[in-house]
């Protein structure tokens, strides 16, 4: 199809060679007067659409993406030729950075329902450049964490070295939807909830005497819990004595709850105390039996092939530890009567 009638948008992706980052292109279709498919014009940030970057009753996935080869060859279907580029509804996700992503990307409706739709397309000229050393050394990361329940902020990586006063107007999107009230280079979150996580995109316009282009950065925001302030607690065994039958096999389970730590090095082990001696027992590997956002429960068993009289004089101690401290729980075996 003839792409000369497509509206054109120029974008710049400056990527950091130090970190993994992603990039997105929105199928930002214009609105020819009589087209029913391209259901929106460029929106001012005051107009909040239901969906961004695409509106209308049509299925949001009803767009086709192409790349225009620089050598003038026919347009290539993105899905067939570029495994590192994923189409999700109206958005094109670039999973890996690199100058080889530079080029012209065209999107248009899959279904051409009227002659007007032929010109309903947008051509995005993407320039991809590695960040130069002269760029800001402490630019914000493309992966940012927000602490649940606290105050936090999301910074636009390409503008994080500029003060709020000198920063240009920024357009923010979250999961493809326009955040109409956000215009600065930083989004401040008064209280962080789990719904604040997602893919944020910040755009601002740069221009020289010849042309203008959109500088875009993508930020993956995670919501996390803060590191625990507590040492682990032992959930099992609860009792300090255990009735057993002599000569029978026995498994004692130690289950301990460890609070969340970003650097997580849990210790869970069994040792035996016999009068003045104590030694660690080589027991099966510890295994995680539950994982939540706030904590992890780890289990480690001690297995006795058969309980002997000597075992009744010993104490079996489960020892657990994290970066805050340690906890122990000892179990004394007692012969079952009758």
């Amino acid at each position: 199809f003839n792409i000369s009638g497509c509206s054109t948008k120029k974008l710049l992706w400056t990527y950091s060679t130090r970190s993994e980052e992603e990039f997105v292109l929105f199928c930002d279709l214009p609105e020819p007067q009589k087209s029913h498919f391209c259901h929106r014009n460029r929106l001012s940030p005051k107009q909040v659409p239901e969906h961004l970057p695409f509106m209308g009753s049509n299925d949001l996935s009803d767009v086709q993406w192409y790349q225009q080869p620089s050598n003038g060859d026919p347009l290539e279907d993105i899905r067939k030729s570029y495994p590192h580029i994923i189409q999700d509804k109206c958005t094109l996700h670039f999973l890996t950075p690199g100058v080889n992503n530079s080029g012209s990307y065209i999107c248009r409706p899959k279904m051409i329902k009227s002659p007007y739709d032929v010109a309903c397309c947008v051509k995005m000229i993407l320039e991809v450049k590695p960040q130069t050393n002269a760029s800001c050394e402490y630019s914000a990361s493309h992966k940012q964490d927000l602490l649940l329940g606290s105050t936090g902020s999301i910074s636009c990586p390409s503008l994080s070295c500029q003060s709020d006063a000198q920063s240009p107007a920024v357009t923010w999107y979250k999961n493809g939807k326009l955040l109409s009230v956000e215009r600065s280079n930083r989004i401040v979150v008064d209280e962080v909830y789990d719904y604040h996580q997602g893919t944020y995109v910040c755009d601002y316009t740069q221009s020289d005497t010849v042309s203008s282009w959109t500088v875009r950065a993508v930020v993956q925001v995670r919501t996390i819990v803060g590191d625990t302030k507590l040492k682990p607690d032992i959930l099992d065994p609860v009792e300090d004595t255990l009735e057993v039958e002599l000569g029978k096999p026995l498994t004692i389970s130690c289950k301990a709850r460890f609070g969340f730590e970003r650097v997580f090095n849990p210790v869970i082990k069994w040792y035996i105390k016999d009068s003045d001696l104590e030694w660690e027992v080589s027991v099966p590997e510890a295994k995680s039996i539950k994982s939540t956002l706030k904590d992890e429960i780890i289990e480690r068993n001690i297995i006795l092939e058969k309980v002997t009289q000597r075992d009744l004089r010993r104490k079996f101690v489960c020892f657990v530890q994290n970066s805050i401290g340690n906890t122990t729980q000892s179990v004394q075996l007692k012969e079952k009567r009758g």
């Epitope: 789990d194 925001v221 995670r222 039996i289 539950k290 994982s291 939540t292």
Partner: antibody
Framework: SVEESGGRLVTPGTPLTLTCTVS????????LGWVRQAPGKGLEYIGY?????SAYYATWVNGRFTISKTSTTVDLKMTSLTAADTATYFC?????????????WGPGTLVTVSS | AAVLTQTPSPVSAAVGGTVSISCQSS????????LAWFQQKPGQPPKLLIY???TLASGVPSRFKGSGSGTQFTLTISDVQCDDAATYYC???????????FGGGTEVVVK
């Protein structure tokens, strides 16, 4: 959003992988679980994959199913399928605490096991 | 594995009335409160109503109330509406996730 795919008619014993594709959800801060429902029956919990990538399964699974993930998908690999595994398979996102409050569900994908 | 036993189906309720569904667990749920309630209508995926035994999920009307602790839990629907006709499930979570599971479901019929 979350959406399941890969459900189809298979013969007993044929392995099958279902995929749950997420968008706008960071799997490094959300657990994602699988639940199934046989026609006309109740919900059955299969298991979940934690934010750190560890998988946890209901006792009845007994090693037949495996849950794994990439940054945007969670797979449920099923082996030794029998007619009893015929069901709609749902994936569900949990962001509250790890594995107990599935607050966002996909529409489900139907798996039929029949000779 | 833990067993979750729900009120047998069906349970009838009159519009504007109150209905209660119980869920009993054979083991104590994690933290005494790791129990969730779901509503499911034919042809739809389940919808979360209550988590943490008593916390109302986002967007759920306050007519739905969860209570209980340990092994015994109840979902109460007050001022029942026609739209509440559905099957309700409890989901328990335990110290070991391998014990996690749903109750058998309770169908609520609204008259």
């Amino acid at each position: 959003s979350v959406e399941e795919s890969g459900g189809r008619l298979v013969t007993p014993g044929t392995p099958l992988t279902l995929t749950c594709t997420v968008s706008g959800i960071d799997l490094s801060s959300n657990a994602l679980g699988w639940v199934r429902q046989a026609p006309g029956k109740g919900l059955e919990y299969i298991g979940y994959i934690s934010t750190g990538g560890s998988a946890y399964y209901a006792t009845w699974v007994n090693g037949r199913f495996t849950i794994s993930k990439t940054s945007t998908t969670v797979d449920l690999k099923m082996t030794s399928l029998t007619a009893a595994d015929t069901a709609t398979y749902f994936c569900a996102r949990d962001s509250y605490a790890g594995d107990y409050a599935f607050n966002l569900w996909g529409p489900g994908t139907l798996v039929t096991v029949s000779s | 594995a833990a067993v979750l036993t729900q009120t047998p189906s069906p349970v009838s309720a009159a519009v504007g009335g109150t209905v209660s569904i119980s869920c009993q667990s054979s083991k104590t749920v994690y933290n005494n409160n790791w129990l969730a309630w779901f509503q499911q209508k034919p042809g739809q995926p389940p919808k979360l109503l209550i988590y943490g035994a008593s916390t109302l999920a986002s967007g759920v009307p306050s007519r739905f109330k969860g209570s209980g602790s340990g092994t015994q839990f109840t979902l109460t629907i007050s001022d029942v509406q026609c739209d509440d006709a559905a099957t309700y499930y409890c989901l328990g979570s335990y110290i070991s996730s391998s014990d996690n599971g749903f109750g058998g479901g309770t169908e609520v019929v609204v008259k």
